[in-house]
Interface confidence: low
């Protein structure tokens, strides 16, 4: 019997895009690909696997804002940027089953219009395949 | 016989925390989890597997210091920060079996008190599973 | 029959070095190791596997220049740096089979000599093993 070298099960990863953020709320995220191994639900990215994640966040905003990326109620943010018009950041964080990654946005303008975003992109890539997953 | 899709062996990774650094020495690192796949010994992280590592370093220091992260005697540092009060950096480096990752810290204060650290965290994640490892 | 835990097939990754860049052209890249799992061809890194890549770019340049790292004709750059004498950046990008990663460099000097580079290093590490590859 010929031994076939083992294939990797697909790595948990996702790229979401956002073109609009709402003041006092978050950013409207969409996943452009149907082949993503992670899912978006209620404007949050659902974490099924425990482990470290590589996180990349990019975007140019139509006005100055403060933006945070959260993963769990009562925990500090993964990213927190104050009074910025753009972001291009990379980070590493430990996330776990049941966590949800979502945005919170505040703008200091007197208008309540949505904030437009150019090149808004959030990427999560699981770094610990082989660890606990609950699908 | 039913074929079970292969699982990933665990990836070499570790998150260590540090709340204190000693002038002219290093930072006292502790691993909060017993499940880490890499080990701390003599205040250094032991490298068992050759390959690229993703390295994340964070912390807020109680006073201005110069901080370097080394991996091998006679080699330049992985990170080197001069006269900082905080760090939030990500890097990629090639490390090999027998390397040890450790801090060196210098403070320019006249007092010889330890430097306190808030949110001190160092993460290493191996990026080349399948390469040479010696346990 | 004893069950051997599956090994990882080698991850697609490469580290190239560059010590010289040519104005209006690119940087001359060489791979110091014969064991790399990705190849250099015509001064470009060849992408065989679809997926996210972790990209690290470092270097100190002998004069001020503008530098871009491209992956596909007609697409925006992976990195774009204007009027710099050094670079130390990390990014994440989705690349696909048939992409080629290469430099473009412009210097505003009146001389047409090559730009010398200290510590010039470009690392690519595939983050989605298990995805589509064409060798």
């Amino acid at each position: 019997l010929q031994q076939v070298p083992p294939q990797y099960p697909p790595i948990q990863s996702i790229r979401v895009q956002f073109t609009r953020c709402e003041n006092e709320k978050g950013c409207i995220i969409t996943s452009p690909s149907k082949d993503e191994t992670m899912k978006v639900q209620d404007n949050s990215i659902i974490i099924n696997c425990d482990g470290f994640y590589l996180i990349s966040l990019k975007g140019y905003f139509s006005e100055e804002l403060s933006l945070s990326l959260y993963y769990r109620k009562g925990r500090g943010p993964l990213f927190s940027l104050s009074k910025v018009t753009s972001v291009d950041s990379i980070g590493v964080a430990y996330l776990a089953f049941k966590d949800k990654v979502y945005f919170n946005v505040t703008t200091h303008s007197t208008s309540y219009k949505d904030i437009q975003v150019n090149g808004g992109e959030l990427i999560l890539i699981h770094q610990n395949p082989g660890g606990f997953c609950a699908y | 016989l039913q074929q079970v899709p292969p699982q990933y062996p665990p990836i070499q990774s570790i998150r260590v925390q540090f709340t204190r650094c000693e002038n002219e020495k290093g930072c006292i690192i502790t691993s909060p989890s017993k499940d880490e796949t890499m080990k701390v010994q003599d205040n250094s992280i032991i490298i068992n597997c050759d390959g690229f590592y993703l390295i994340s370093l964070k912390g807020y220091f109680s006073e201005e210091l110069s901080l370097s992260l080394y991996y091998r005697k006679g080699r330049g540092p992985l990170f080197s920060l001069s006269k900082v009060t905080s760090v939030d950096s990500i890097g990629v480096a090639y490390l090999a079996f027998k390397d040890k990752v450790y801090f060196n810290v210098t403070t320019h204060s006249t007092s010889y008190k330890d430097i306190q650290v808030n949110g001190g965290e160092l993460i290493l994640i191996h990026q080349n599973p399948g390469g040479f490892c010696a346990y | 029959l004893q069950q051997v835990p599956p090994q990882y097939p080698p991850i697609q990754s490469i580290r190239v070095q560059f010590t010289r860049c040519e104005n209006e052209k690119g940087c001359i890249i060489t791979s110091p190791s014969k064991d790399e799992t990705m190849k250099v061809q015509d001064n470009s890194i060849i992408i065989n596997c679809d997926g996210f890549y972790l990209i690290s770019l470092k270097g100190y340049f002998s004069e001020e220049l503008s530098l871009s790292l491209y992956y596909r004709k007609g697409r925006g750059p992976l990195f774009s740096l204007s009027k710099v004498t050094s670079v130390d950046s990390i990014g994440v990008a989705y690349l696909a089979f048939k992409d080629k990663v290469y430099f473009n460099v412009t210097t505003h000097s009146t001389s047409y000599k090559d730009i010398q580079v200290n510590g010039g290093e470009l690392i690519l590490i595939h983050q989605n093993p298990g995805g589509f590859c064409a060798y």
């Epitope: - | 110069s66 330049g76 080197s80 001069s82 | 002998s62 004069e63 009027k83 004498t85 200290n118 510590g119």
Partner: antibody, heavy 118, light 107 residues
Framework: EVQLVESGGDLVKPGGSLRLSCVAS????????MNWVRQAPGKGLHWVAF????????SYEDTVQGRFTISRDYAKNTLYLQMNSLRAEDTAVYYC???????????WGQGTLVTVSS | SYVLTQLPSVSVTLRQTAHITCGGD??????VYWYQQKLGQAPVMIIY???NRPTGIPERFSGASSGNTATLTISGSLAEDEADYYC??????????FGGGTHLTVL
């Protein structure tokens, strides 16, 4: 506090040699690029030589190329300038300067006087 | 080789604005640095990369660069600003280049 202290300046005859030293303190020496800059009496600043933080890259002003050598000793936190075949036009105050990025002369020493005369 | 041209001297009335220029071929495409040197002292960097002030440098110092001219502006000049001012770039041969210097006199 960052401090750069130059020494080694002297009166020397044309054709002679001299080695200048610059002892650095108050910063992590191996993270900074280093330069020598000179200033002839009553004249402007004139860059002489550069060495990068790791010591692997050096560059020189055209008139000193082949005569001067810049180097650094990490154990002693010291920058050197070895000056050979000295000429009258090399007479100047020599400053060492360090920078955290290649293009910066962030901090300067107080200088050491080199006089080349017969 | 590249040349940076500065006027030898500029005068300004106390608390008025001084403009010190530095000319060079397409200098706007390079990063420009400015240094202040008071009599008998070592130089001090006052502007880096065209228009950035190091910590501790007063806000009255600012820089700009475009085309063939870089300008150091001192708004509300004080007696203590009397000094020599040098512009600097890195030229195309890994070599730093300083302008000839401008002596600012505060009247």
């Amino acid at each position: 506090e960052v401090q750069l202290v130059e020494s080694g300046g002297d009166l020397v005859k044309p054709g002679g040699s001299l080695r200048l030293s610059c002892v650095a303190s108050g910063f992590t020496f191996n993270t900074y690029h280093m330069n020598w800059v000179r200033q002839a009496p009553g004249k402007g600043l004139h860059w002489v030589a550069f060495i990068n933080s790791g010591g692997s890259g050096t560059s020189y002003e055209d008139t000193v190329q082949g005569r001067f050598t810049i180097s650094r000793d990490y154990a002693k936190n010291t920058l050197y300038l070895q000056m050979n075949s000295l000429r009258a036009e090399d007479t100047a105050v020599y400053y060492c300067a360090c920078g955290s990025i290649w293009t910066h002369f962030d901090y300067w020493g107080q200088g050491t006087l080199v006089t080349v005369s017969s | 080789s590249y040349v940076l041209t500065q006027l030898p001297s500029v005068s300004v009335t106390l608390r008025q604005t001084a403009h010190i220029t530095c000319g060079g071929d397409i200098i706007g495409s390079k990063s420009v640095y400015w240094y202040q040197q008071k009599l008998g002292q070592a130089p001090v960097m006052i502007i880096y990369r065209d228009n950035n002030r190091p910590t501790g440098i007063p806000e009255r110092f600012s820089g700009a660069s475009s085309g063939n001219t870089a300008t150091l502006t001192i708004s509300g000049s004080l007696a203590e600003d009397e000094a020599d001012y040098y512009c600097q770039v890195w030229d195309s041969r890994t070599q730093a280049l300083f302008g000839g210097g401008t002596h600012l006199t505060v009247l």
